[in-house]
């Protein structure tokens, strides 16, 4: 029995859901109570998931797994991960018994995205030509560990005197500090890129010292510049600094974060104490950090009704805002290519060809392209329809005639994450059915 | 000893523009939020608009909005409240105050009156 | 209309005890701090209390005040007749990103 599995590794962002492709060729009067199929981890041989005398055996694996029951007649034994995890990390065995029987495994390649590196200067105030500075770059819960680099404002990495370190949290998600010790000029921008080498993500962050610093006591709040990006299901955290001044204690602070646009409270810190969440108690400060200017929030379970801008706005004697945007990001699942017909296809044949691909947010951007990487504009009609969460399923047909063989390929781009997800099918000049029989 | 003096006061014809100021001694002024509140005759005070130590955030009452503009020059330890398309609602005596804790405003001028009147 | 409600006026007797309640909602006081300011005739109005309860140096301890929920009053104990004055509260408005003042209180010393 051929079982089949896609060669390259399935990468799987923490806290979306990925599907291990697994496929075998039915034969002829095959019927579920003759399958047996068992997922496990490649190494450890530990129980996934399995199908057995014709029933579901459900989950054996934290209640985290599903088949695709729908499917499994015509071949498609593939295995749903749910809210995947770093530990999830490794390989999987496909095992399908019929009669005949085989195995293949696939491999879970898990990644984070590294957060928009956040930037501090020690020391801070009174900076003058020929002082010593340390610049940190921090930028947090990606996966795996992160490449960082560093360079001047003319683009010239900076290599020497910088120290990084890596520490993973209790979900294995790293946070990257990296620290850059430099005599300052007159004034100069030092850049930090903190890039994920499974991903191919690059998150950069920039600080520009001048002498003067502003005034001690006034209040300047600071957010990121550029969105952040979040992916739906997990937690972002919105970054927002003040400079505290002299003598300052918690008791004089006042801290409201709202949405920008129609002022809803979402949380608030007051009167010495956190006032808690305003927002379906889905946020949180950094309690230990806001004596140090740290007046960020964390959100969490980010839903795609999250996206907006929110405005933090920071009281004490003197008092600032500013609003940070939160852009959410869904990335869309691998394509699926149906064919109709699909049976006996010869040359000449008018063909639909039709690429789905769920789940994903914001709308996709669809391309299709021949074997020759030559693009197919005409007769293409891509619908997406968002479902109750705000997640697009995305469907893309194109109508062709057949030429002696050929392959097409459809993919779905989400513009945000610039994550590109394709298939494929050949189509071979011989009377042929797909899927491809044994 | 810490002070705030507005001048610029006076009387404007409905749709006229005025221009207020309010000069700061005895403290670090670039370090304070700064605000304008206003008091109409015999009625009770209104906040108006104010603007952050840096001058990088302003903030406005609704009834202002897209009329008035705050803004200040720390090198002159000046705060100013420009006034367009005045209307005789806006007549009142217009305090400049520092802002302080918990939202609080603990320095007020004299104040100026505006007289908005034809 | 003010976004904080105060009483128009008050009154006691030299050596009373009065109480100006300040009501308002879950954007303004429910969530922050509460301001209290004295405005004697002719003057620029002073800050009395600021953080629901604090004094400002040289604020008699006669004065005082508190907040419960999404409302805050200002108690004036050993009442004197220098107390004469308008009373204001004021908050932040998260709703409204902006400052807020109560409609005042007039208190009149019998």
């Known amino acids: 029995l051929e079982v089949q599995v896609p060669e390259d590794p399935v990468v799987a962002l923490v806290g979306t859901d990925a599907t291990l492709c697994c496929s075998f060729s039915p034969e002829p009067g095959f019927s579920l109570a003759q399958l047996n199929l068992i997922w496990q981890l490649t190494d450890t041989k530990q129980l996934v998931h399995s199908f057995a005398e014709g029933q579901d055996q459900g989950s054996a694996y934290a209640n985290r797994t599903a088949l695709f029951p729908d499917l499994l007649a015509q071949g498609n034994a593939s295995l749903r991960l749910q809210r995947v995890r770093v530990a999830d990390e490794g390989s999987f065995t496909c095992f399908v018994s019929i009669r005949d029987f085989g195995s293949a495994a696939v491999s879970l390649q898990v990644a984070a995205p590294y957060s928009k590196p956040s930037m501090t200067l020690e020391p801070n105030k009174d900076l003058r030509p020929g002082d010593t500075v340390t610049i940190t770059c921090s930028s947090y819960q990606g996966y795996p560990e992160a490449e960082v680099f560093w360079q001047d404002g003319q683009g010239v990495p900076l290599t020497g005197n910088v120290t990084t370190s890596q520490m993973a949290n209790e979900q294995g998600l790293f946070d990257v500090h990296s620290i850059l010790r430099v005599v300052l000029g007159a004034n100069g921008t030092y850049s930090c890129l903190v890039r994920n080498p499974v991903l191919q993500q690059d998150a950069h962050s920039s600080v520009t010292i001048t002498p003067q610093r502003s005034p001690t006591g006034a209040v300047e709040v600071q957010v990121p510049e550029d969105p952040v990006v979040a992916l739906v299901g997990t937690d972002a955290t919105l970054r927002c600094s003040f400079s505290p001044e002299p003598g300052f204690s918690l008791a004089q602070l006042n801290l409201i974060w709202q949405l920008t646009d129609t002022k809803q409270l979402v949380h608030s810190f007051t009167e010495g104490r956190d006032q808690g969440s305003a927002y379906a108690n889905r946020t949180a400060l950094f309690p230990d950090l806001l004596a140090q200017g740290n007046a960020s929030l964390r959100l969490q379970r980010v839903r795609v009704a999250d996206e907006g801008s929110f405005t933090c706005f920071v009281s004490i004697r003197d008092f600032g805002s500013a609003a940070v945007s939160l852009q959410v990001a869904a990335p869309y699942s691998k394509p699926s290519m149906t064919l109709e017909p699909n049976k006996d296809l010869r040359p000449g044949d008018t063909v639909t060809i039709t690429c789905s691909s769920y789940r994903g947010y914001p709308e996709a951007e669809v391309f299709w392209q021949d074997g020759q990487g030559v693009p197919l504009t005409g007769n293409v009609t891509t619908s997406q329809m968002a479902n109750e969460q705000g997640l697009f399923d995305v469907h893309s047909v194109l109508r062709v005639v057949l030429g002696a063989n050929g392959t097409y390929s459809c993919l779905v781009r989400n513009p945000v994450l610039q994550q590109d997800a394709h298939g494929s099918v050949t189509i071979t000049g011989q009377p042929m059915t797909f899927p491809p029989e044994a | 000893e810490v002070q705030l003096l507005e001048s610029g006061g006076g009387l404007v014809q409905p749709g006229g523009s005025l221009r207020l100021s309010c000069a700061a001694s005895?403290?670090?002024?670039?370090?304070?939020?700064m605000h304008w509140v206003r008091q109409a005759p015999g009625k009770g005070l209104e906040w108006v608009s104010a603007?952050?130590?840096?001058?990088?955030?302003?903030y406005y009452a609704d009834s202002v909005k897209g009329r008035f503009t705050i803004s200040r020059d720390n090198s002159k330890n000046t705060l100013y409240l420009q006034m367009n398309s005045l209307r005789a609602e806006d007549t009142a005596v217009y305090y400049c105050?520092?802002?302080?804790?918990?939202?609080?405003?603990?320095?007020w001028g004299q104040g100026t009156l505006v007289t908005v009147s034809s | 209309q003010s976004v904080l409600t105060q009483p128009p006026s008050a009154s006691g007797t030299p050596g009373q005890r009065v109480t100006i309640s300040c009501s308002g909602g879950s954007s303004n006081i429910g969530s922050n701090p509460v301001n209290w300011y004295q405005q004697l005739p002719g003057t620029a109005p002073k800050l009395l209390i600021y953080?629901?309860?604090k004094r400002p140096s040289g604020v008699p301890d006669r004065f005082s005040g508190s907040k419960s929920g999404t409302s805050a009053s200002l108690a004036i104990s050993g009442l004197r007749s220098e107390d004469e004055a308008d009373y204001y509260c004021?908050?932040?408005?998260?709703?409204?990103?902006?400052?807020?003042f109560g409609g005042g209180t007039k208190l009149t010393v019998l």
């Open positions: 005895g403290f670090t002024f670039s370090t304070y939020g």
């Open positions: 603007i952050s130590g840096s001058g990088g955030s302003t």
């Open positions: 004021q908050s932040y408005d998260s709703s409204l990103s902006g400052w807020v």
């Open positions: 105050t520092r802002g302080y804790y918990y939202y609080g405003m603990d320095v």
């Open positions: 953080g629901n309860s």
